[in-house]
Every structure is written in C-alpha cells, then in structure tokens.
C-alpha cells in the first residue's frame, strides 16, 4: 500500500548490524509523486566499491547509489548525511553485510517522503503536445485556440476529420491552406461517389508542400490515399512527388493527412472528379465486339458475337452471341462466357453402316460414314463425308444435315451359280448363288427378297395363308438348318388386285396377275446368304427376247423327291408363249382351252428337261441386268406350268413395277432418322 513517508533502519540499529545479512525494503508512494530519500546516520564497513558491506538504492533497473563508510552532515542546520531525489513513485533499498566485520559498525538510519514532481519539466519526453500544467500529484495538458485535446489527454490537434465528399467534382485542401497546417494532427477526408464511378485525383506539383522525409526516407508529415485495398503514398516533401493524375479504380477514397509536432509547411490542395469506371478492352478469342471502341466505361453494353464455328455454351444451351455490360466494379458482366468451338457431338449412327469414332467433334472436324459393303451402298450419295459446321450439325456437301442411307445392294450373289453336277434337269445350288431366295413352308414355295422389308412372290402362294412363315439364308430346308436360319415374320400380304380369288383354288385355270407382296414386320439384315434381287427397269432394255437366259431356284419337286432338301437351280431360256400353250397339261382340272395365257406371262424352259415344278412357285426367274452385267433382276416369278420338265410360265414382273413401287411406298413405315 503506497505511503507518503517512512523510516528505514539497518538491522539491530542503533546496535551493530550482524554479519551475513541481506535485507531489502520496497518503497512506494502514490502515483504522481516522486520520492525524497535521505540518510541521517551512516556507519557501514568501508570497502572499495562497497564490496563488503553496503546499502544500495535502486530505481527500476537503475542503481541510484551504493553507500558504505561513515558520513557526517556538511550543514550544521541539517542532520542529512546523504540524500536521493527520484521522480518515480517506487524505490528499492537493499542492505548487505559480509561474513566478518573488523570493527563494530552501527549501520544506517534513513527516511523517505513523497514529493511532488513537475511532469512538465522533470522528464526528457514532454508529456503534452502544446501546454503542460503541473499540480501537486499530477499534471494536465491544454491546447491553443481552435485546437482540441485528443482522447489521450496529451495531444492537441485541429478538428479536420469527418468530411464526406459525394459530389462528382470537388476540391480539398489541408487546414489553413496555404497557411501552415496544424501540427500533431490527423485529418481524414472521405470521398464517396456512386457505384460505377472511379475517383480521379489531380494535383499540381506547386500545390504541395509538406515536411520532408527524414534521413531514413520516412515521411514526418504525410498524405496518403486509400482506395479499397490499394494505397497511394505516403507522400511528403516540396512539390508533389506522386503522379499528378491518380486513377483510383474505386468509387470510395480515404485521404489521410498526418502531421507531427514540428516543421509546419503550407500543406496541399487537390482536385478530384468522378470518372465512369473503365472496363478493359478484353481480348475474347474467336469473337467480335460491337460497338468497337477505344475505351469502354461504366454502363457501356457490348454485343460479343462468336465467329462462325464458335458458340457460347451456358448450361446446355448454345448461342452465337451474348451481351456484356461494363459494371460498377470495372469488370464486364458475363466475363465467364467464352466463344468455344462448336461441338457437333458424337455423330448419329446409321442403320447398316458405320461412322469411325472421330478424333474430334469440334468445328471443322471431318467424319466419314460408310455402308456395310458389299451388301449395302449409300443410296442418297454425298460420299459419306460430313464436317462439323458452324451451326453445330454434321453437314454433307450434297445432303446437308441429312444422314446417309445405307440400302441393300440388289442382284449381286456372293458366289456365281455354276452348273456343276446335273441333277434331274437342274443343279445343286448354294444359297450364296441365290441370296434373294425365300423359303415358304406352308404352302411349300418360294419368294424373292426385293428389299429389307418386302418379299415378292406369286399370288397363289399366299392366297390361302395370309400369315406365311418364311426363311432366308439357308441352302438346306432341313429342320435343323431352318432352326439356324433367319425366320421372317409377315406384317401384311398384298395380293395384286387383278388376281381372281376362287372358292376352289385347285381348279384354277387363270393365273393372270399371279403376283403378291409380303410386307415384313422387321427389316432383314443383309449378308452373304441374304441379299435382295433387283426389280426390272421400265425401259425397253428390260423387255425379254426369246432365247434370253434366266436362272430359277427353289426347293420344289425333283425327279426323286417331292421336295428338295437342298436348293436346286437351273438356267433356262425364254421361249415364245405358244411353246407353253402347245404342251399338254399333265393333270388337267379343265379343258386345255380353259387355261389362260396373257402378255403378263413369260414362257421359259424346254431345254434338257430343265424346269420349275411344284414347290418352286413364287421364286424369281433371275435375268442378268442389261445395263449392269454384275446384277440380276427378277424378270419373272414361278407361276404355273402345263407339265414339269417342259415349259413353265412366269409372271412378267416388268408389267407390275408400278404396282410394286406404289404398294411399297404406300405401306412403308417412316424411318426413324
């Protein structure tokens, strides 16, 4: 507890002090006071530097004195032999004695009193910036007119802060400008403009005179500009050392002017104005800016249009242009949007064809569609080459965005038919010689595949069974073979309207218009054993002449069997119709004259007993295409005959091409493109 005065006596005083003693006293007087310590008696063993016995006076970390020996007063009117005055309110006194004393020493008597200190004069560091006023136990600071005392109660400054400038143009100067600015002041000015405008500060060199920097380059008085996280300055010296035009890139600016106690100069004056915030002219690749300007500022709007083949992708939507606005923060809106190369995506697959996996699907990439050769070809031309166009579509020079169509190649057998070994007027054949050959199991008959959805046959084959089961791709019609072959399911049977339906078909004598089409439920996949036959052209090139050769095939009756196990075939010449008329009907169901012969029929055969027979009905009479020797077309369909092994009658397909085409067109399912 601090006291105003006190007494300190050495141990056993006034008797001799003991050996080997160390004792300390902590003196504390109230704050605002100093301590006056004085000794009235001093009798301590003398030694050099008071090394043996001593009384030590310590203030803080400083030794104020170390005493030993005997002292007496110099002043007859005063008992004081030694005294200490400290301007602090704490003091420590330490007494030490060693292990022996040569004589008897009585020690010391000392007193302390609290004394007033003059804070205004007693210290090196002046406590007040302007006026210091001392009183007993303390001091206070005061200020000259127009200055005020800061919260620290020590520093005086002028009231130069708190001004907020919101006008788009203005002038700000240091206090008293051009008279010397106040010392020991911190002036803060705030410029706050509306968003989208940046504060631009302009100064003239001659309008700036602030106390220069010290030898280390630190400004003693300084002017600083702070805009967000950017700082300009500190500036000081004679003549403005910074840029005369400061673009702050911010709508908010704080101006801080800090002065110390000394060296006042005239100060500074500046002008400011609000500039619409500029946005950088950014380099956005693969695009054009409209309007094109040298400089863009707040609220400017540009349309950024991608070059051909480039697009803006935002989410899943692609666009060719976008708008960008110069924002209040000096940044462009939609700055994340970029013009990227158009991506045409993975090209669509096509039926019976393929497209190589593209290395790239971006603008300018090229892909090639091919058909599954040699069974399919590209119907709609264009070569199959597509490039990724600017609109994001794969485009062909001929077809545009339309996909190529792979359609079956017709009339080309994988292996040509060769009459190897003569078997009952015909030869063993392989289905690869007649890949268009269709087998009907009820009734036992044939047909010809003319495209992936249609089978051509004789009307009399399907008139009694409108849901025939058909097979393709097998040479043998043994059950185990058919189980492995392709079964075709009919969707609808179309019999020629000119075909006369009878109550008792067995007694038929009129086979005119013996032609029918079977529409299939599913498309047939072509390959080496399944491939369509062509239809005849409508030109006169496709008119048959007597002697023209054609091929017939089927699993019909042979000399040995009612039904052939393996496909049989024969090459027959076209004959005049009268040759067929002349042959006597084997098992007539009516008069010979009752049998009808029309121009819709072709007569063929008569050579070496080669002929079609029961069970071959509906199969094609295949003739080499006069305009393309690699192909065969269905000139006829096995229809009827007077007698097996002589001449046979075939439906003249050329006469029905229009009906065939019309029926197929009217009953086609639109392709799912």
């Amino acid at each position: 507890e601090p006291t105003m005065y006190g007494e300190i006596l050495s141990p056993n005083y006034p008797q001799a002090y003991p050996s080997e003693v160390e004792k300390s006293w902590d003196i504390e007087v109230p704050e605002g006071y100093g301590i006056h310590l004085y000794f009235t008696h001093l009798d301590i063993e003398l030694s050099e530097n008071c090394a043996y016995d001593s009384v030590q006076i310590i203030s803080g970390d400083t030794e104020e004195g170390r005493l030993c020996g005997q002292r007496s007063s110099n002043n007859p009117h005063s008992p004081i032999v030694e005294e200490f005055q400290v301007p602090y309110n704490k003091l420590q006194v330490i007494f030490k004695s060693d292990f022996s004393n040569e004589e008897r020493f009585t020690g010391f008597a000392a007193y302390y009193v609290a004394t007033d200190i003059n804070e205004c004069t007693d210290f090196v560091d002046v406590p007040c910036s302007h006026f210091c006023n001392n009183f007993i136990g303390g001091y206070f600071c005061s200020c000259p007119p127009e200055y005020f005392l800061h919260d620290d109660m020590k520093n005086c400054g002028v009231n130069c802060s708190g001004d907020v400038f919101t006008a788009l143009i203005g002038e700000i100067a240091s206090p008293n400008y051009p008279k010397p600015y106040p010392e020991n002041s911190r002036c803060e000015y705030q410029i706050r403009l509306e968003k989208g405008f940046q504060v631009v500060v302009t100064l003239r060199r001659e309008d700036f005179d602030v106390e220069a920097a010290d030898s280390a380059g630190n400004c003693l008085d300084s002017l600083v500009f702070v805009a967000g996280d950017r700082q300009f300055g500190p500036y000081c010296g004679h003549g403005f050392p910074g840029p005369l035009n400061i673009e702050t890139k911010s709508n908010a600016l704080d101006i801080i002017f800090q002065t110390d106690l000394t060296g006042q100069k005239k100060g500074w004056k500046l002008r400011y104005h609000g500039d619409p915030m500029p946005c950088p002219k950014e380099d956005t690749p693969n695009s054009v800016w409209e309007p094109a300007k040298a400089k863009y500022v707040f609220r400017d709007v540009v349309q950024i249009t991608c070059l051909d083949g480039f697009e803006v992708v935002e989410g899943r939507v692609g666009a060719t242009s976008f708008y960008s606005t110069c924002q209040s923060n000096g940044k462009w809106s939609n700055s994340k949007l970029k013009c990227q190369p158009v991506d045409c995506g993975i090209p669509e697959s096509i039926e019976n064809g393929k497209v190589e996996d593209p290395e790239s699907t971006l603008f300018g990439s090229v892909i090639r569609y091919t058909c599954e050769e040699p069974y399919y070809y590209m119907e709609n031309g264009g070569g199959g080459e597509y490039h990724c166009a600017g609109n994001g579509s794969w485009v062909n020079e001929v077809l545009g965005p339309e996909l190529p169509k792979c359609v079956p190649v017709c009339g080309v057998p994988r292996e040509p038919f060769e009459e190897k070994q003569r078997i009952i007027g015909g030869s063993d054949a392989d289905i690869k010689n007649f890949p268009w050959q269709v087998f009907f199991d009820n009734p036992w008959a044939g047909g010809a595949l003319i495209n992936e959805y249609w089978v051509l046959t004789a009307a009399h084959v399907v008139e009694g069974n409108r849901e025939p089961t058909m097979y393709v791709g097998s040479t043998s019609v043994q059950t185990s073979r058919l189980a492995k072959s392709k079964m075709l399911t009919p969707e609808h049977v179309f019999i020629h309207p000119g075909w006369k339906l009878l109550e008792v078909p067995e007694g038929r004598t009129n086979f005119d218009n013996d032609i029918a089409l079977v529409r299939l439920k599913d498309p047939v996949k072509m390959g080496p054993t399944v491939s369509p036959i062509c239809l005849p052209g409508t030109s006169s090139d496709y008119n048959l002449m007597d002697g023209d050769l054609g091929l017939i095939s089927g699993w019909g009756r042979t000399e040995k069997r009612d039904r052939a196990v393996r496909l049989k075939a024969a090459r027959l010449p076209v004959a005049p119709l009268r040759k067929c008329k002349e042959v006597k009907v084997e098992k007539p169901t009516a008069d010979a004259e009752a049998y009808v012969f029309t121009p819709n029929m072709i007569c063929a055969g008569g050579e070496k007993g080669m002929d079609s027979c029961k069970g071959d009905s509906g199969g094609a009479f295949a003739v080499q295409d006069p305009n393309d020797k690699t192909k065969f077309y269905a000139a006829g369909l096995v229809s009827w005959g007077p007698q097996c092994g002589t001449y046979g009658l075939y439906t003249r397909v050329k006469n029905y091409v229009d009906w065939i085409m019309k029926t197929m067109q009217e009953n086609s399912t639109p392709r799912e493109d």
């Epitope: 036992w444 040479t475 043998s476 059950t479 040995k560 039904r563």
Partner: antibody
Framework: QVQLVQSGAEVKKPGASVKVSCKVS????????MHWVRQAPGKGLEWMGT????????IYAQKFQGRVTMTEDTSTDTAYMELSSLRSEDTAVYYC????????????WGQGTLVTVSS | DIQMTQSPSTLSASVGDRVTITCRAS??????LAWYQQKPGKAPKLLIY???SLESGVPSRFSGSGSGTEFTLTISSLQPDDFATYYC?????????FGQGTKVEIK
C-alpha cells in the same frame, strides 16, 4: 417315302464294339441328314448324334463323345454307327432316323437294332 | 443341354376321356417341339411338330399347344388305339432331347 432298313440284333461282351448299319432306299443318302437315337429297355429315347451334310461334320452327344463313330457310304446309301467300349448299360434298341424338312424333326425311322451287352 | 420334363409319367384313362400331357423345357425353345407316340416293339411315330402342327395322317383328336417353355399334348377323346407311351422332343438345337415319356394305360 424314304425307307430305312437296319442290320440285325447283336450280342456283345463288355469292352467290345458294335457297328450297326442303316440302308437307305427311295432316296440318296447325300440328300439326307441321318441321326441315331437309342432306347434302353423300358426307358426313354436318347439322341446320340448326326452327320451334318451342310457343314460336313459329325456332331455327337456329349455323353457318347469318344466312344461313338458315325460314318456314311454314299456309294451304297448306307449309314453306320459304331459304339466301342461297350458296357451293360449300352444294352438298347438303336434307331437310325432321317431328319425332316421345314419344322418336322424326323421323317423316317429304321425298325431298330437291339444290341445286348452281356458277359 | 436343354432338359425336357414330362408329366405325368403314367396316366390311367378310359376310352372317350380327354387326356392332357405337359412338357416343360429348361429354357425357351420357341416352337421347336414335337410329340411322338410309341407302341411296344415299334419305332416312335411323329404326331405333332412345330408345337401345334398335325403331321399328315394323324387323327385330328390329337392337338398340341404352347411355346417357349410350356407345352401340352391333348387327346380330345381317347380311342383304344391311343393306349401307348408319348414322348415330347425339343429340336431347337442339334442336341435333341426327349422327355422321359408318359404311359397312357387303360383305367
């Protein structure tokens, strides 16, 4: 109709082999697929194998693989089935059967040959 | 191999009865199924093929139905000549397999 005439009954000792013949008449063997089926006394029918003329290969049931050989002599229109390493459970009637056409599994059956395996 | 399970194994019936025999395949065989009749000491005789097609010369009282894995043979009115053993057969693959047989005997 094709007729199939098989060789007569045989009695064999275990470990021996038996060769059953099947003569085709009314058609040529080259036109046909010949299958062999057996039936143990009082038991069901069991398919043994066939010659596939399309592929030119003989297909055997897994059970008989390595013990059965099916051959054909087209000059005499005769098919043969030889079963080796006979055991008592091979006692059965062995049938030759021609495959049918267009959904019919079988066309003609031989009269059957009884093979008895007994020591 | 495809397994064929026939039921029942024995069936006692009288002349004039309607008789049904079922056959189940271990996997789908579409319609590649046949039914045979066999009399003692004779070779089997084809009755039905393609699951439901009647072989020529077979009386119309015999009928077949089913596809996939479930098949039936029906004799609409049993005749004295019909007492025999009946087998189903699958032929969807070269490894033909037969059912174990159903013996139809006089009650």
């Amino acid at each position: 109709q094709v007729q199939l005439v098989q060789s007569g009954a045989e009695v064999k000792k275990p470990g021996a082999s038996v060769k059953v013949s099947c003569k085709v008449s009314g058609d040529t063997l080259t036109e046909l697929s010949m299958h062999w089926v057996r039936q143990a006394p009082g038991k069901g029918l069991e398919w043994m194998g066939t010659f596939d003329p399309e592929e030119g290969e003989t297909i055997y049931a897994q059970k008989f693989q390595g013990r059965v050989t099916m051959t054909e002599d087209t000059s005499t229109d005769t098919a043969y089935m030889e079963l080796s390493s006979l055991r008592s459970e091979d006692t059965a009637v062995y049938y030759c059967v021609t495959e049918g056409l267009a959904w019919r599994p079988t066309d003609s059956w031989g009269q059957g040959t009884l093979v008895t395996v007994s020591s | 191999d495809i397994q064929m399970t026939q039921s029942p194994s024995t069936l006692s019936a009288s002349v004039g009865d309607r008789v049904t025999i079922t056959c189940r395949a271990s996997q789908s065989i579409s319609s590649w199924l046949a039914w045979y009749q066999q009399k003692p000491g004779k070779a089997p005789k084809l009755l039905i093929y393609k699951a439901s097609s009647l072989e020529s010369g077979v009386p119309s009282r015999f009928s077949g139905s089913g596809s996939g894995t479930e098949f039936t043979l029906t004799i609409s009115s049993l005749q004295p000549d019909d007492f025999a053993t009946y087998y189903c057969q699958q032929y969807s693959s070269y490894a033909w397999t037969f059912g174990q047989g159903t013996k139809v005997e006089i009650k």
